[in-house]
């Protein structure tokens, strides 16, 4: 396993309507063909996964159903949006690439976008 | 140019097992997914998985789990999909396509079902 | 899964017409991809990331859309365009096509 660097944004602060969108780039040593991402929450030092791809020569990443990701690639560059957020989802989110293919087998982990999430505040009632 | 050829048709008995294989030239194998479709007579189209060849990734389509099975011999350049306890409403025209963007597809292996 | 609702089902047309199709998708996608059959021959990509043409596909034909509302566009209808189109999306597993509209040329 060979270490790679990936860059992603320190902070992203999430719309009204709990959407997050991040870029992910990774310094590929070579022309990688099928590139795995994932993308982990942490929160009070636990890890947990969000989502994960796995694309190849497309521009459109493809995640399992019900998943809250979607995305996009161009070139080193992956484009993530995360959908659904609420305060309690707040955290650090840290972009892992692989790349899984041809080899050697690449590793890179980022430092982490920490989101911020504000619930928007319900409409006062109105009159009309 | 790029070019997928599948096996010719078939005819099998219910409860037997088939090998379909889509063989690709043209390009580089490991590039690529190979996407397998079924389409029923006068049906629509339905997305059975793909298997990344590098590597032997594989996503099915939960309707197909435990149906079908996806693999790659890269050495040959070809792809396989092998259908089991096979059934009537196996019997269908089966597609292999190349990439994300389903941009070649094979002609098409006609199945069919009959005891 | 995302189930694409394709509309209409059938539809004829004169050739110099326009036609239009339409693909909704249960919940939001990021692209839609639109492919061409004719009868006992293989889907061809017509339309890939909502709106760009494949390789070949003459500009009477064009996609838009956003979400989970898309549509494909003939502007001049030619009688070789009588086929079956299917919409697919890519954004989740597992991909998923709509149930196709078959395209009358009269």
């Known amino acids: 396993c060979k270490a790679m660097h990936v860059a992603q944004p320190a902070v992203v602060l999430a719309s009204s309507r709990g959407i997050a969108s991040f870029v992910c780039e990774y310094a590929s040593p070579g022309k990688a063909t099928e590139v795995r991402v994932t993308v982990l929450r942490q929160a009070d030092s636990q890890v947990t996964e969000v989502c994960a791809a796995t694309y190849m020569m497309g521009n459109e990443l493809t995640f399992l159903d019900d998943s809250i990701c979607t995305g996009t690639s161009s070139g080193n560059q992956v484009n993530l949006t995360i959908q659904g957020l609420r305060a309690m989802d707040t955290g650090l989110y840290i972009c892992k690439v692989e790349l899984m293919y041809p080899p050697p087998y690449y590793l890179g982990i980022g430092n982490g976008t920490q989101i911020y999430v504000i619930d928007p505040e319900p409409c006062p009632d109105s009159d009309f | 140019q790029v070019h997928l050829q599948q096996s010719g048709d078939v005819l099998v008995k219910p409860g037997a097992s088939v090998n379909l294989s889509c063989k690709a030239s043209?390009?580089?194998?490991?590039s690529y997914w190979i996407n397998w479709i079924k389409q029923r007579p006068g049906q629509g189209l339905e997305w059975?998985?793909?298997?990344?060849?590098?590597?032997?990734?594989?996503y099915y389509n939960e309707m197909f789990t435990g149906k079908a099975t996806l693999t790659v011999v890269t050495s040959s350049t070809t792809a396989y999909i092998h259908l089991n306890s096979l059934s009537f409403e196996d019997s269908a025209v089966y597609f292999c396509a190349r990439g994300d963007y389903f941009d070649y597809w094979d002609q098409g292996t006609t199945l069919t079902v009959s005891s | 899964q995302i189930v694409l609702t394709q509309s209409p089902a059938i539809m004829s047309a004169s050739p110099g017409g326009k036609v239009t199709i339409t693909c909704s998708a249960s919940k939001s996608v990021s692209y839609i991809h639109w492919f061409q059959q004719k009868p006992g021959t293989s889907p061809k990509l017509l339309i890939y990331?909502?709106?760009t043409l494949a390789s070949g596909v003459p500009a009477r034909f064009s996609g838009s859309g956003s979400g989970p509302s898309y549509s494909l566009t003939i502007s001049r209808v030619e009688a070789e365009d009588a086929a079956t189109y299917y919409c697919?999306?890519?954004?989740?597993?597992?991909?998923?096509f709509g149930g196709g509209t078959k395209l009358e040329v009269r």
């Open positions: 990331d909502t709106s």
């Open positions: 697919q999306q890519r954004t989740t597993y597992p991909l998923t």
């Open positions: 059975i998985g793909r298997i990344a060849p590098g590597s032997g990734t594989t």
């Open positions: 043209g390009y580089t194998f490991t």
